[in-house]
């Protein structure tokens, strides 16, 4: 007889969840050398531990710690790339910029990147029914909680000069609702991080504001000079030659003239 | 050196299709957005189009949206601008631009042009 | 858009003097200005970008100068080469566009 299951608002877990951590885990750790002493079966019981049997609308920061834990990863200063709303540029970004790092370019944001998970209260199974979503079942759901507690660790271990890269095509450029805005602004080190420099992308040539400039971005400068961390600004007025520029730096069309 | 050389200008009767092509050399074609500009007889210049550097972004003058495309083969190092519905204004020497695009400072030149192509549109 | 207004429309002058050539906007482009050089049956030439740079290759007898809405460019001494017509062009807010020319003629 089926059981019955709670109903919720969102997609439930992605299919095949735990071979695709598992997988995942495995790739990471086999380009990564680094990493290559990290036990992916732990890092599956970890990962699971943090949710399965457990109220998806009562996950806590503490239920990944044994995660975390196994997960430690530290990124050279002056190498973090924050974003916010702009992910798939950031991430060709670091693709090509091998020496710079998005949290999915650490293990765990690298695990759990576009996947979605949670289990159910007193049971060992995993929901692939529906799943808690953020808005309108609860804020503290497995995957919110997940991003919530890596992305504070990752800006808490960051140092040097920081940046992030903003969508300048969003009617709010720096949101203080994102994780960006309610959680790595908040957590950055100000002994150890001397600078946030922003970068700013444009969506398209018709827009020549410098939207350094906007509203939003000021009330970002303020947050974090109130932190005692220096800001810096960067239109990005066209996202495709920079892309272009950093795979190939010493072309002309490259070097400042215009 | 760097060089641009248009073709497929002519004579063609009002309403009518034409095709024109812009062939590059002696530089990184898909390292800069591509223009056609275009000049009347006796007249000035007046900026027609232009392309991004992969072509994903297309702009017009207002005087030929829905009317031109532009479009680029950066395997071909090509630049492509096929006007449709021509009308007697739209008779000119037409250039192909190279534009330096630089991605942290908005707008640009044309450091390059190519010597023209003449399109006559009348009956 | 913005409207660049070229002046004087022709200007006459004899070999070896100086020709000073305006472009006023109807609006701020700041220094994003270029001046292009075009002879009869050529295409046009690149002189000066952003206001006041010379392009490669661009004689030094050639200089832009001004910001913002006016500006100017100065041939210090012209050569029986120089005598062309001259368009100045913004390329501060889309869409980029021309003046309607200076032709340089001589006296």
């Known amino acids: 007889v089926p059981r019955w299951r709670q109903q919720w608002s969102g997609s439930g877990t992605t299919s095949r969840f735990p071979e695709t951590v598992l997988a995942r885990c495995v790739k990471y750790t086999e380009v990564h050398p680094e990493m290559r002493h990290v036990d992916c079966q732990s890092v599956w019981d970890a990962f699971k531990g943090a949710f399965i049997s457990k109220y998806p609308c009562n996950i806590t920061e503490e239920d990944y710690q044994p995660l975390v834990k196994l997960g430690t990863q530290t990124v050279p200063c002056n190498k973090t790339l924050l974003w916010s709303r702009i992910k798939d540029l950031a991430h060709q970004f670091t693709q090509v910029q091998r020496d710079m790092f998005t949290l999915e370019d650490m293990l765990l944001g690298y695990l759990a990147d576009d996947l979605t998970w949670c289990g159910e209260f007193n049971t060992f199974e995993i929901n692939y029914q529906s799943c808690p979503d953020w808005r309108k079942d609860c804020s503290n759901n497995p995957v919110s909680v997940f991003w919530k507690t890596v992305s504070r660790r990752f800006a808490e271990t960051a140092c040097g000069v920081v940046h992030v890269m903003l969508n300048g095509s969003r009617s709010k450029i720096f949101d203080k609702n994102s994780t960006f805005g309610s959680v790595e602004v908040h957590n950055l080190q100000p002994e150890k991080v001397q600078a946030l420099e922003a970068w700013v992308i444009h969506g398209g040539r018709e827009d020549s504001r410098d939207l350094c400039q906007d509203p939003t971005i000021k009330e970002l400068e303020s947050i974090i000079s109130k932190r005692n961390i220096r800001f810096f600004c960067k239109n990005i007025y066209r996202p495709d030659k920079f892309l272009q520029c950093v795979k190939n730096p010493e072309d002309s069309s490259c070097l400042s003239g215009i | 050196e760097v060089q641009l050389l248009e073709s497929g200008g002519g004579l063609v009767q009002p309403g009518g299709s034409l095709r024109l092509s812009c062939a590059a050399s002696g530089f990184t074609f898909s390292f800069y957005d591509m223009s056609w500009v275009r000049q009347a007889p006796g007249k000035g210049l007046e900026w027609v189009s232009a392309?991004?550097?992969?072509?994903?972004?297309?702009y017009y003058a207002d005087s030929v949206k829905g009317r031109f495309t532009i479009s680029r083969d950066n395997s071909k190092n090509t630049l492509y601008l096929q006007m449709n519905s021509l009308r007697a204004e739209d008779t000119a020497v037409y250039y192909c631009a190279r534009e330096p695009v630089s991605y942290d400072y908005y707008g640009s030149y044309f450091d390059y042009w190519g010597q023209g192509t003449l399109v006559t549109v009348s009956s | 858009e913005i409207v660049m207004t070229q002046s004087p429309a022709t200007l006459s002058v004899s070999p070896g003097e100086r020709a000073t050539l305006s472009c006023r906007a109807s609006?701020?482009?700041?220094?994003?200005l270029a001046w292009y050089q075009q002879k009869p049956g050529q295409a046009p030439r690149l002189l000066i970008y952003?206001?006041?740079t010379r392009a490669t290759g661009i004689p030094a007898r050639f200089s832009g100068s001004g910001s913002g809405t006016e500006f100017t460019l100065t041939i210090s001494s012209l050569q029986s080469e120089d005598f062309a017509v001259y368009y100045c062009?913004?390329?501060?807010?889309?869409?980029?566009?021309f003046g309607q020319g200076t032709k340089v003629e001589i006296k």
């Open positions: 392309v991004s550097l992969y072509g994903d972004e297309t």
């Open positions: 062009q913004q390329y501060n807010n889309w869409p980029w566009t």
């Open positions: 609006q701020s482009v700041s220094s994003n």
């Open positions: 952003g206001a006041s």
